[in-house]
Interface confidence: low
Amino acid sequence: TGADTEAVVCVGTACYTAHSGKLSAAEAQNHCNQNGGNLATVKSKEEAQHVQRVLAQLLRREAALTARMSKFWIGLQREKGKCLDPSLPLKGFSWVGGGEDTPYSNWHKELRNSCISKRCVSLLLDLSQPLLPSRLPKWSEGPCGSPGSPGSNIEGFVCKFSFKGMCRPLALGGPGQVTYTTPFQTTSSSLEAVPFASAANVACGEGDKDETQSHYFLCKEKAPDVFDWGSSGPLCVSPKYGCNFNNGGCHQDCFEGGDGSFLCGCRPGFRLLDDLVTCASRNPCSSSPCRGGATCVLGPHGKNYTCRCPQGYQLDSSQLDCVDVDECQDSPCAQECVNTPGGFRCECWVGYEPGGPGEGACQDVDECALGRSPCAQGCTNTDGSFHCSCEEGYVLAGEDGTQCQDVDECVGPGGPLCDSLCFNTQGSFHCGCLPGWVLAPNGVSCTMGPVSLGPPSGPPDEEDKGEKEGSTVPRAATASPTRGPEGTPKATPTTSRPSLSSDAPITSAPLKMLAPSGSPGVWREPSIHHATAASGPQEPAGGDSSVATQNNDGTDGQK
């Protein structure tokens, strides 16, 4: 399923778009990426409110969203193998577009420790509550979904697009309609700020086609950090309305001439810009000439200014912008140093955590410690890692090698271990015999029981019967459903394999088959090995079969 838009909020130097559609986190990121953005960051309370605003916009027009709880992907993810770090606000998660470990977080609940699979974060919206600024969406962490299974309850995602700057919305001085087309392929007629490189189409008039005039503008960078449309004077002006329509499209004051014409003006302390609509402060700092977090400091008599940088930054060659000082040059950390805007932080490799003597030191994480082991059974801690092991009768399984799966000894690589019936159980197996046979003390072979079975043409004669009663059948001619003697073809059953989970008694199979020549008077059982017990060990039904449990090492007894 694709993603539908769309709601847009542009503020500062970024635009946020909200989309509905059941996509995995990777598909959502790809969708944002195609238009030059990323899944949205929520790095501060202010940014959370911008994101909330765009979701509020989407939800008000999305009548289809009936779920009480809705989730929307954001760009916060933790890679497979990276463990939870409860000491950090982002708990070891990081923003998809990169960037520092930000201080703001709004987790829905305590996070479960896991380093095994990739985890992604969505915003959790309780649609039964009004979307007020005091109810900022909570962060919910979970699996990242896949194309076939996008993640439970995921209703959509939020993208963020960053720009060099924004233009003010175009001001109309009379009836008309503005349509903005943004670089991220969204059209809107109402944006609080319009991103650089957006196009604006203005259709003037009140819908009467004869009177309609069209204008086309592009939001351009007129000077460093100064963005405008290159239009002059209010658009769609009409002598009929004068200053009465939208204040003539003027930013501050509108002055009407007697002939219905009008001009825009500014209040004391402000000056009219080249667009003849917008007013800007005469204070040189009011145009925010300093960039990158630099503070504008007025010079004497308010004439000129200098830019000042916060701690951890220095002015670049333009003397307007602050650039980060790279503290990692001095190697202050034991393992990894991450330079962050205005500072740095030490990180530990996967399998280590901050700790030990000295600043930025790392110590091994004991993944096997009580309550945090990722292994289903045995866990061995190693320096910087761990490995899982399984008890006898189980092997490691799962994509991450942390689960244990029962070994089916009845279909083992060396062939079945029982001479007759074999029953697989959790972590073990046991052997059994068909009616008329009993299990030998070794728990593997079958011996003829006190009552023998006759051949299809009639029962064997008395001598034969007496001869076999109670004696162990030799290996070469053993009653083995699993393998015949060397050079002897295996007897095959004439019916389908009986299953222990079916209600049919096991004796319903044709048990009497003529033995191959060379072993007179010995009846071979059909090959019906691997009668796997469906839920724990079950006795074969019908007849006096005998069963013993067998360890993998060949000794009797249960594990």
Partner: antibody, heavy 120, light 111 residues
Framework: QVQLQQSGAEVKKPGASVKVSCKAS????????MHWVRQAPGQGLEWIGE????????YYNQKFKGRVTMTRDKSTSTVYMQLSSLTSEDTAVYYC?????????????WGAGTTVTVSS | DIQMTQSPSTLSASVGDRVTITCKAS??????????MNWYQQKPGKAPKLLIY???NLESGVPSRFSGSGSGTEFTLTISSLQPDDFATYYC?????????FGGGTKLEIK
């Protein structure tokens, strides 16, 4: 300066509807939400609902849902509030007030009020 | 709905007096360190006027003798030295949750 200019007093019969207008000037109309608040004679203030003039989204107090409709005309920077199925309990002064778009939505500018009298 | 209870409902005082009006919310109106509580003044036949927003912030143009404090469920409006122009009705309002609700009002009259 920032002003909210409301329409004149209305007298209505029970069961009828009333439509009150509020014209904004002196600020960017689409940058603030517009709210409606009423005050019955000798009583306190009661919030009816709000409209976002930029996209025409509305939120209503559940108490008035089904009876109230808020609309806006961007070309004239005017917001309207229509209340239907009037009863004598709807006799009140109806105020429009603007609030910031997001954050603490306190009402920083108010209209002078429109008196609506419901009487048979 | 969040109920807002103001006390007293009527208060008699003289010019120069220090006056305190309290407002109690039926549940907290705080979120992420902010209090979504506002105070208005209303004179007969006039629209309300914003005095204090977010519990303690003075609206521009409002005299500094007005101040607000409190958090969670309990808030106060204080007039440090009553002036003749201050005799009016005062309302508290929460904007933390829909519906936005007002207190019943406190009428401040001349003693």
């Amino acid at each position: 300066q920032v002003q909210l200019q409301q329409s004149g007093a209305e007298v209505k019969k029970p069961g009828a509807s009333v439509k009150v207008s509020c014209k904004a000037s002196g600020y960017t109309f689409t940058s603030y939400w517009m709210h409606w608040v009423r005050q019955a004679p000798g009583q306190g203030l009661e919030w009816i609902g709000e409209i976002d003039p930029s996209a025409s989204y509305t939120y209503y107090n559940q108490k008035f849902k089904g009876r109230v409709t808020m609309t806006r005309d961007k070309s004239t920077s005017t917001v309207y509030m229509q209340l239907s199925s009037l009863t004598s309990e709807d006799t009140a002064v109806y105020y429009c007030a603007r609030s910031v778009y997001y954050g603490n939505k306190y009402f920083d500018v108010w209209g002078a009020g429109t008196t609506v009298t419901v009487s048979s | 709905d969040i109920q807002m209870t103001q006390s007293p409902s009527t208060l008699s005082a003289s010019v120069g007096d220090r006056v305190t009006i309290t407002c109690k919310a039926s549940q907290s109106v705080d979120y992420a360190g902010d209090s979504y509580m506002n105070w208005y003044q209303q004179k007969p036949g006039k629209a309300p006027k914003l005095l204090i927003y977010a519990a303690s912030n003075l609206e521009s143009g409002v005299p500094s003798r007005f101040s607000g404090s409190g958090s969670g469920t309990e808030f106060t409006l204080t007039i440090s030295s009553l002036q003749p122009d201050d005799f009016a009705t005062y309302y508290c309002q929460q904007t933390n949750e829909d519906p936005r609700t007002f207190g019943g009002g406190t009428k401040l009259e001349i003693k």
